[in-house]
Amino acid sequence: LSTCKTIDMELVKRKRIEAIRGQILSKLRLASPPSQGEVPPGPLPEAVLALYNSTRDRVAGESAEPEPEPEADYYAKEVTRVLMVETHNEIYDKFKQSTHSIYMFFNTSELREAVPEPVLLSRAELRLLRLKLKVEQHVELYQKYSNNSWRYLSNRLLAPSDSPEWLSFDVTGVVRQWLSRGGEIEGFRLSAHCSCDSRDNTLQVDINGFTTGRRGDLATIHGMNRPFLLLMATPLERAQHLQSSRHRR
Amino acid sequence: LSTCKTIDMELVKRKRIEAIRGQILSKLRLASPPSQGEVPPGPLPEAVLALYNSTRDRVAGESAEPEPEPEADYYAKEVTRVLMVETHNEIYDKFKQSTHSIYMFFNTSELREAVPEPVLLSRAELRLLRLKLKVEQHVELYQKYSNNSWRYLSNRLLAPSDSPEWLSFDVTGVVRQWLSRGGEIEGFRLSAHCSCDSRDNTLQVDINGFTTGRRGDLATIHGMNRPFLLLMATPLERAQHLQSSRHRR
Amino acid sequence: ALDTNYCFSSTEKNCCVRQLYIDFRKDLGWKWIHEPKGYHANFCLGPCPYIWSLDTQYSKVLALYNQHNPGASAAPCCVPQALEPLPIVYYVGRKPKVEQLSNMIVRSCKCS
Amino acid sequence: ALDTNYCFSSTEKNCCVRQLYIDFRKDLGWKWIHEPKGYHANFCLGPCPYIWSLDTQYSKVLALYNQHNPGASAAPCCVPQALEPLPIVYYVGRKPKVEQLSNMIVRSCKCS
């Protein structure tokens, strides 16, 4: 490449590589690479790999190109996931089985462990594995609000499909609310969209984690793929760095 | 400002101004500024000013910061608007008045006049002026599909408000469909959101252009502010330039 | 668009995205990032000729604005346009962490 | 953020958004744009010091990355971050037109 003077491509690459070295460490707020002295031998734990793959894979409803990030979003976000409370838990008994809805509850103590302060949360996604679907279905997501009331959050038009597919709903605001409140268990409801005229309100879509009578080994896989919250948050120690350096300039 | 050498701020400003001169013309695909020789004397027509103000004002549900634009979107879009067919038109008689819905129809010949080819349309917004609202209302937008069926498009949670406010729905895909089809009149329905459990399905929100018994002068203002489609499209002649220059590099 | 599809298959002299694969172990001497082993970072390089709009061949100048100076800058610069995040797995002590680093992979460039 | 709120009220020497109002008639000699009469175009200006991550004062270097070289560029550059569109009214012959020009107003800058 030539402009006025010839560009030394190798020098540019070296400078880029050196800049990336600092960029990664600065995004992780590490003064130096962490020591590997205490890393357990053998491959990465399954759960860690599963989480890494969840983060790496794009899911339906997620944009491929992120928007320009605000300054606070420059820093890396720690990714964790909290699985839905299993369906044999007594909390589900309080909600009558219906043809138009399924319920998903989450333990807020697990959420708080992952994200100690609401302000640290930058993104929360509810991820559901939908199994094959014969007909188009319009679904709605609600948040458990008070004793027996539900607040509408969002909707999705699901196209028929022969293969399972992850669905993702942005529930950042809701999870932030939950982290601010004192409740022990909080939940979502996925319902068929009910038009004012139509009376066909059956939820046709099959969400992984709700069907019963499976073979033992399949049930385990099924349980791992049950609905979960994928959380991206600034780790507490990094947040403290952020606050102290925010007003420096 | 000083780096290694002092920056000549005035030179930078002059270069920026010169660049803007070219940028505006290139975005409009004009070889030179258009002559004003045949511009009618007097102020701008009211309709043009109203359209300009619609474009300039941010409305509820619109993002303040546009996302990075694809290459084709670099060029300016011509902005036009098509008003809803007035409510005394016979088309409305076919749809029974209901407490949960209002109907909005549009003349597709007017749409085609504004946008001759579906591919030229880059954005279409349905804009409604909502009058004051006493209670929170969850509304849904539907598209007239076949004889008497409606297809869900989107929804909005309207907060109580003492003052009128413009609502905007992105209906680009729908309008593109309409431009491709042969229909003469096409329409939307705005309905109360009907939950599967709830039976209170009344549309509480008052949309400008649907109430009756107004004083004459108010009725005119009211008519001008009735629902409309705001269209942004590449003018035909510019599209031809685009196609011919697309594969130059 | 000055993206990987166009730039990697052309000999574009002006602003374009250039290939660069970072192998954490080889290039940075790091063994602490467990996943991935490396990533396609890429980078932007190439001139963005400033366009004087008083140029004599004005019609030609206008056609170049979109590529060379779409933001009408006084000194346009070749910079990333589309960026993608990079999730990584690493350990802090005995504890594995999965983190997503924003804007790490350059997919396309622009003159800005 | 290097936006109008921060930059217009500070004496920042490094990369920042700078004030620039364009009056179509006075600055461009144009009378053909009927609305608006002008607009706050603004522009980005100021150095983005390149950060060598092998600097001796390494902890200080890391703190500067976000501002001076967030994209880990080999030659960071001060460019627009947030941009806004500009609608205009003009005539072509006898016909008035309302058009929206994308990315015309610089609201903030970044080192990229």
């Epitope: - | 070889a31 500024p33 258009p34 002559s35 | - | 000699g29 009378k31 012959g93």
Partner: antibody, heavy 118, light 107 residues
Framework: EVQLVQSGAEVKKPGASVKVSCKAS????????MHWVRQAPGQGLEWMGR????????KYAQKFQGRATLTVDTSTSTAYMELSRLRSDDTAVYYC???????????WGQGTLVTVSS | DIQMTQSPSSLSASVGDRVTITCRAS??????LNWYQQKPGKAVKLLIY???YLETGVPSRFSGSGSGTDYTLTISSLQPEDFATYFC?????????FGQGTKLEIK
């Protein structure tokens, strides 16, 4: 190639009328206004009027109002200029010219000489 | 109507010479000034529009400048094919008006 081809030279008597044609090719006829300009022997160029082929809208220079008639036939992409009540000082070369909204004429016909002589 | 005064009315020059023709408008025409070349038996040709913008295909030895009421056409190095009559025209206000022309002849 964009071209404007005009009809041949005409000789007319004072008081008569002349109709000059201008056939356009190589572009969309209705996308540009067509203007007419004349040049008397040894003189400068003089603008006569314009027609918008799309809307049929016409504008004449005051001097030619009532005597000149501009028309178009969009099916053949042809513009016409008719000048009535001819006088000897109407002797000139008549040009059709495609107008760009930048205020200039980017394509001209080759010209039609109209001689008015008794 | 806006009057356009062109000077000189005729001009003799040699191949390789630098030539300047001027045009003055009776009022500010905001750069809407165009230059044309006319040769006997040939169609009139647009050279420069909006004061300084060179029409596609026109050699770069032709250039234009000016603002307000005063405008100039310059031919940096005359070529044999440049001997012709040159007209200016204002495109700011109807009716469009032309200069009287400058006849450029071989010395």
């Amino acid at each position: 190639e964009v071209q404007l081809v005009q009809s041949g030279a005409e000789v007319k008597k004072p008081g008569a009328s002349v109709k000059v044609s201008c056939k356009a090719s190589g572009y969309t006829f209705t996308s540009y206004d067509m203007h007419w300009v004349r040049q008397a022997p040894g003189q400068g160029l003089e603008w006569m009027g314009r027609i918008d082929p799309q809307s049929g809208g016409i504008k004449y220079a005051q001097k030619f109002q009532g005597r000149a008639t501009l028309t178009v036939d969009t099916s053949t992409s042809t513009a016409y200029m008719e000048l009535s009540r001819l006088r000897s000082d109407d002797t000139a070369v008549y040009y059709c010219a495609r107008y760009d909204h930048g205020g200039y004429f980017d394509v001209w016909g080759q010209g039609t000489l109209v001689t008015v002589s008794s | 109507d806006i009057q356009m005064t062109q000077s000189p009315s005729s001009l003799s020059a040699s191949v390789g010479d630098r030539v300047t023709i001027t045009c003055r408008a009776s009022q500010d025409i905001y750069n809407y000034l165009n230059w044309y070349q006319q040769k006997p038996g040939k169609a009139v040709k647009l050279l420069i529009y909006y004061t300084s913008y060179l029409e596609t295909g026109v050699p770069s030895r032709f250039s234009g400048s000016g603002s307000g009421t005063d405008y100039t056409l310059t031919i940096s190095s005359l070529q044999p094919e440049d001997f012709a009559t040159y007209f200016c025209q204002q495109g700011d206000t109807l009716p469009w008006t032309f200069g009287q022309g400058t006849k450029l002849e071989i010395k």
